[in-house]
């Protein structure tokens, strides 16, 4: 299963939809900054199987979806771009759910890390949290343009070491 | 290695006109902003402004709003500050550091070296 | 725009001692406060960010704390290669804003 360099490819598109939705300047939301805690230690070990390792990126891109697939995403991203971006997170949803029943038979491991998958889900309870106590205001939807796009890149850096590994 | 590289030390007349550069490598450039800062000789920093590479979005401190102009060129990784007309008082070492934007990481982490302006007739 | 006094100007101090500067913001900044080391002709190095994180390869020696309009950096023990001037900034919101600068110079 070739999932790394097409999801790269994926990646790279819903990372450029996601930098051209910016509404309001995000100079003018600097004290809206945030901690969430991303999960490095869950992308940063080789501890993995691939499709361990897969379904904890799965988890993040459902995660994701779910976030800008709210009534209250609706109402401040630009419809165009959020349809293109949905459907960008949707085929790399597809493609990984088909790479990941072509792996079981490989691997005599878990399918599933849960630990990984139980952090990144906290990671996004932690997003919808600010959001909900931010009101939902477009610096904090800002700011969590921002994060996903820097937990989307660093989920880049985590594939690439997965290809090499292949 | 992340590395941000500033044009060398330049002379002028008042009156001048004056662009420095600072080329950031090592890191992807559209993905932190970068922040000017000036240090007059003896005297503190002051931040001067700051630009997101990625549309060219600037900011400015009201006390150098009009007085310059931020710019970037992403294809090639670079970030401007530049005088239309150069006074004697922007003899100073600029310099330019690295931003993470709205992201909860180190401001400022990486600096350039420093460009040395002197105007003087 | 936030104004940031730091105190005490300059200092004069030992290899060894303990020495503490502080840095006080004209409104809350809530955390958003970091710490550079400065030294002659060199450019600024960040130590301290969001007002208690210690940057990377930054010795454990140096801290910092504090949080809405009073914050400070502590050298535990000072070394040789800490004389220098500290200054504080103000990562709140814009214009960002730094305080005058703290010299730490040998006793």
């Known amino acids: 299963c070739d999932l790394p360099q097409t999801h790269s490819l994926g990646n790279r598109r819903a990372l450029i939809l996601l930098a051209q939705m910016g509404r309001i300047s995000p100079f003018s939301c600097l004290k809206d900054r945030h901690d969430f805690g991303f999960p490095q230690e869950e992308f940063d070990g080789n501890q993995f199987q691939k499709a361990q390792a897969i379904s904890v990126l799965h988890e993040m891109i459902q995660q994701t979806f779910n976030l800008f697939s709210t009534k209250d995403s609706s109402a401040t991203w630009e419809q165009s771009l959020l349809e293109k971006f949905s459907t960008e997170l949707n085929q790399q949803l597809n493609d990984m759910e088909a790479c990941v029943i072509q792996e079981v038979g490989v691997e005599e491991t878990p399918l599933m890390n849960v630990d990984s998958i139980l952090a990144v889900k906290k990671y996004f309870q932690r997003i919808t949290l600010y959001l909900t106590e931010k009101k939902y205001s477009p610096c904090a939807w800002e700011v969590v343009r921002a994060e996903i796009m820097r937990s989307f890149s660093l989920s880049k850096i985590f594939q690439e070491r997965l290809r090499r590994k292949e | 290695e992340v590395q941000l590289v500033q044009s060398g030390a330049e002379v002028k007349k008042p009156g001048e006109s004056l662009k420095i550069s600072c080329k950031g490598s090592?890191?992807?450039?559209?993905?932190?902003?970068i922040g000017w800062v000036r240090q007059m000789p003896g005297k503190g920093l002051e931040w001067m402004g700051i630009?997101?590479?990625?549309?060219?979005?600037?900011a400015y401190s009201p006390s150098f709003q009009g007085q310059v102009t931020i710019s970037a060129d992403k294809s090639i990784s670079t970030a401007y500050l530049q005088w239309s007309s150069l006074k004697a008082s922007d003899t100073a070492m600029y310099y330019c550091?690295?931003?993470?934007?709205?992201?909860?990481?180190?401001?400022?982490?990486?600096w350039g070296q420093g460009t040395l302006v002197t105007v003087s007739s | 725009d936030i104004q940031m006094t730091q105190s005490p100007s300059s200092l004069s101090a030992s290899v060894g001692d303990r020495v503490t500067i502080t840095c006080r913001a004209s409104?809350?900044?809530?955390?958003?406060l970091n710490w550079y080391q400065q030294k002659p002709g060199k450019a600024p190095k960040l130590l301290i960010y969001?007002?208690?994180s210690l940057q990377s390869g930054v010795p454990s020696r140096f801290s910092g704390s504090g949080s809405g309009t009073d914050f400070t950096l502590t050298i535990s023990s000072l070394q040789p290669e800490d004389f220098a001037t500290y200054y504080c900034?103000?990562?709140?919101?814009?214009?960002?804003?730094f305080g005058q600068g703290t010299k730490v110079e040998i006793k």
């Open positions: 550091a690295r931003h993470p934007g709205l992201n909860w990481a180190p401001d400022f982490d990486y």
């Open positions: 090592g890191y992807s450039f559209t993905s932190y902003w």
């Open positions: 630009i997101d590479p990625s549309d060219s979005d600037t």
């Open positions: 409104q809350s900044i809530d955390g958003a």
């Open positions: 969001f007002a208690s």
């Open positions: 900034q103000q990562a709140y919101d814009f214009p960002l804003t």
